[in-house]
Interface confidence: low
């Protein structure tokens, strides 16, 4: 089989026939050196998944539940192409599983016990697997058989396709539990009708069901959605209030050597030649001898899944949790009103050492999880491998786009009610050596630059955003002659000044000596012309405050700030000479962990915060010899956010806009993946 062949897996005679037709028609329109199709027939989707894992086939299209199976070891497959529905201009690749209730019913998600429930059908995604999977650990024990546990949880249900003899309560609202449209409460519209008629209190459906059944907005306004955080939202806010976001139909391939570019090229060409309304003789999204053969008949085209996206990220935390609960049937032993340990994400070796020390001192309240980059940490928090970390504003933006929320803000000024008053922010500045007297904001071109890291606020987003507005392109590595911006491509001139050895060179963690505020300032001291840092960096590392050999003899007076008007000022005049105000670093987590992270961190800072006077003999949460490990070293406390509890509100409109503008220069693969799930 030639190298450019994609071996498609078919699961029935009819699919195999369509696959052969697909193969032959592709041959007729694609040059001989282009991608081609070969067909492999297997007895089931699970056999196809195993065949792909064993390199006997390359691709198959799966529903979300099977994408989960495909991802599990030893299969280790990943999503590579998504089918989309709707229009090319507004492609829909996901649907949202929602819980719909009547507006005046007054209960929340955590008060569903004893209510009457309407389901689309037993074993169906939005109507059963997702809601029951998410409620699984609230079900009364024994939880097996599942139908019995569900019947004992709700006071009555309509769950079409259930066994009405063994589980009569599941058929209480729709006598007989008929498994077809003969049952008026069957399917999406039926479950909604069950709610509408007043038979049930809650209907588990998908987001479009309400719109398909109620054309009139005034009618829709009589209903609300239950959110997982025990609030309610209007039905049109389903993107912010759903049980899970579920991919409709996805092509999977091997994670390693999976031909993902070739599969995309093949399908992209296929949809151009044989997509919707393209060809009479063969149609990709049509199944004359069956239904949904190879691809869904309702699909309109394909979108490439960003390479950073693994199956866990693609399926989303809620969906994976629901399916895992149903499949594995395990629940934590702790009572649900007690917080489980918070899994803190630590970057590389140095942070892990501090985190382990914190974990021991916290007596089990904090556990540690390691990752090599901030983006890897954010991904781990998204998928539940970790729970929280403190982030610079630039990463709060990425985390927010990935569905995480800020819970507490670092405060840097001493005040009586520190924990109740989140600060307005710190200043992003440009520092130069006083001796380089001709250097100004207007003549930085060709100079040597030092940055905290790519994507961070003071070190990158603010200065590069301002620069972008001036030069109108993203070639910052050409603007500066060389520099150190950890997180840049290794062969970039913006890694040339970095000091990390071997693989650690230019890495965005503490293994790179010029990483972070202190690292960027050290880069200026030793090699650079300008450093982009925060206003406290120079005083914190001069006058003997940093005992490291490179810093111990430094004097604040030997450095000056560049002002945007082309002038220069002493370091202490940062309030009148800065690039912008930056939002303070903030702790982020998943929405479902918000309350527990808030509670545990407030306990932890009372034990190990700035009230600890002797850090030589005791653990101090906000100290790490100017290395800003886990938190910034100048943190005085972690403050409540009050109503600034989303990434947009926390960062502020101006900063969100600035980072948004800089997104065209973004190299963040995580941001690309998260905007695929939530454009």
């Amino acid at each position: 089989v030639p190298d450019k062949t994609v071996r498609w897996c078919a699961v029935s005679e009819h699919e195999a026939t369509k696959c052969q037709s697909f193969r032959d028609h592709m041959k007729s329109v694609i040059p001989s050196d282009g991608p081609s199709v070969a067909c492999v027939k297997k007895a089931s989707y699970l056999d196809c998944i195993r065949a792909i894992a064993a390199n006997e086939a390359d691709a198959v299209t799966l529903d979300a539940g099977l994408v989960y199976d495909a991802y599990l070891a030893p299969n280790n497959l990943k999503p590579v192409v998504a089918e989309f529905y709707g229009s090319k201009e507004d492609p829909q690749t996901f649907y949202y599983a929602v819980a719909v209730v009547k507006k005046d019913s007054g209960f929340q998600m955590n008060q569903l016990r004893g209510k009457k429930s309407c389901h689309t059908g037993l074993g169906r995604s939005a109507g059963w697997n997702i809601p029951i999977g998410l409620l699984y650990c609230d079900l009364p024990e024994p939880r097996k058989p599942l139908e019995k546990a569900v019947a004992n949880f709700f006071s009555g249900s309509c769950a079409p396709c259930a066994d009405g003899t063994d589980f009569p309560q599941l058929c209480q609202l729709c006598p007989g539990c008929g498994c077809s449209t003969l049952n008026q409460y069957f399917g999406y519209s039926g479950a909604f009708k069950c709610l509408k008629d007043g038979a049930g209190d809650v209907a588990f459906v998908k987001h479009s069901t309400i719109f398909e059944n109620l054309a009139n907005k005034a009618d829709r306004d009589q209903y609300e959605l239950l959110c997982l955080d025990n609030t309610r939202k209007p039905v049109d806010e389903y993107k912010d209030c759903h049980l899970a976001q579920v991919p409709s139909h996805t092509v999977v391939a091997r994670s390693m050597g999976g031909k993902e570019d070739l599969i995309w090229e093949l399908l992209n060409q296929a949809q151009e030649h044989f997509g919707k309304d393209k060809s009479k003789e063969f149609q990709l999204f049509s199944s004359p001898h069956g239904k949904d053969l190879l691809f869904k008949d309702s699909a309109h085209g394909f979108l490439k899944v960003p390479p950073r996206m693994d199956a866990k990220m693609y399926l989303g935390y809620e969906y994976v949790t629901a399916i895992r609960n149903l499949r594995e049937g395990t629940c934590p032993e702790a009572p649900t009103d007690e917080c489980k340990p918070v899994k803190w994400c630590a970057l590389s070796h140095h942070e892990r050492l501090k985190c382990d020390e914190w974990s021991v001192n916290s007596v089990g309240k904090i556990e540690c999880v390691s990752a090599e980059t901030t983006e890897d940490c954010i991904a781990k928090i998204m998928n539940g491998e970790a729970d929280a970390m403190s982030l610079d504003g630039g990463f709060v933006y990425i985390a927010g786009k990935c569905g995480l929320v800020p819970v507490l803000a670092e405060n840097y000024n001493k005040s009586d009610n520190c924990e109740d008053t989140p600060e307005a922010g710190y200043f992003a500045i440009a520092v130069v050596k006083k001796s380089a007297s001709d250097l100004t904001w207007d003549n930085l071109k060709g100079k040597k630059s030092c940055h905290t890291a790519v994507g961070r606020t003071a070190g990158w987003n603010i200065p590069m955003g301002l620069l972008y507005n001036k030069i109108n392109h993203c070639r910052f590595d050409e603007f500066f002659s060389e520099g150190c911006a950890p997180g840049s491509k290794k062969d970039s001139s913006l890694c040339k000044l970095c000091m990390g050895s071997g693989l650690n060179l230019c890495e965005p963690n503490n293994k790179e000596g010029y990483y972070g505020y202190t690292g960027a300032f050290r880069c200026l001291v030793e090699k650079g012309d300008v450093a982009f840092v925060k206003h406290q960096t120079v005083p914190q590392n001069t006058g003997g405050k940093n005992p490291d050999p490179w810093a111990k003899n430094l004097n604040e007076k030997d450095y000056e700030l560049l002002c945007l008007d082309g002038t220069r000022k002493p370091v202490e005049e940062y309030a009148n000479c800065h690039l912008a105000r930056a939002p303070n670093h903030a702790v982020v987590t998943r929405k479902d962990k918000e309350a527990c992270v808030h509670k545990i961190l407030r306990q932890q800072q009372h034990l190990f915060g700035s009230n600890v006077t002797d850090c030589s003999g005791n653990f101090c949460l906000f100290r790490s010899e100017t290395k800003d490990l886990l938190f910034r070293d100048d943190t005085v406390c972690l403050a409540k956010l009050h109503d600034r509890n989303t990434y947009e509100k926390y960062l502020g409109e101006e900063y969100v806009k600035a980072v948004g503008n800089l997104r065209k220069c973004s190299t963040s693969s995580l941001l690309e993946a998260c905007t695929f799930r939530r454009p």
Epitope: G34, P35, K88, N268, Q271, G275, E672, T675
Partner: nanobody, 128 residues
Framework: EVQLVESGGGLVQPGGSLRLSCAAS????????MGWFRQAPGKGLEGVAV????????YYADSVKGRFTISEDNSKNTVYLQMNSLRAEDTAVYYC?????????????????????WGQGTLVTVSS
């Protein structure tokens, strides 16, 4: 940062030939759509020819099929457009473009919206 530099435009008589070049720098070459678009005076942007870089397939607008050939030299990160049997209606500014990252999610490889990196353009005039 990625840059595209076009060359090879000029004045040519009807029936004549021209070869346009587009050199890409600043990104990992291969595995992206790259190709040629044109804009005639007073008209919109039209996809001409595109290939999937690194040995992939080619796509042509119906109006140029059989006359224009798109090719690449991997070692030079360069894409070429060989234009034969030129006609007056081929007169336009020809732009080289590259679809990087999420831009590749558009469905048609000849859809200008799919391309996020553009060259400055080179003028091709076909006139006797």
């Amino acid at each position: 940062e990625v840059q595209l530099v076009e060359s090879g435009g000029g004045l040519v008589q009807p029936g004549g030939s021209l070869r346009l070049s587009c050199a890409a720098s600043g990104h990992a070459y291969g595995g992206n759509y790259m190709g040629w678009f044109r804009q005639a005076p007073g008209k919109g942007l039209e996809g001409v020819a595109v290939l999937y870089t690194g040995g992939g397939s080619t796509y042509y607008a119906d109006s140029v099929k059989g006359r224009f050939t798109i090719s690449e030299d991997n070692s030079k990160n360069t894409v070429y457009l060989q234009m034969n049997s030129l006609r007056a209606e081929d007169t336009a500014v020809y732009y080289c473009a590259l679809a990087l990252g999420s831009a590749r999610w558009y469905t048609s490889s000849l859809d200008a919206r799919a391309y996020n990196i553009w060259g400055q353009g080179t003028l091709v005039t076909v006139s006797s």
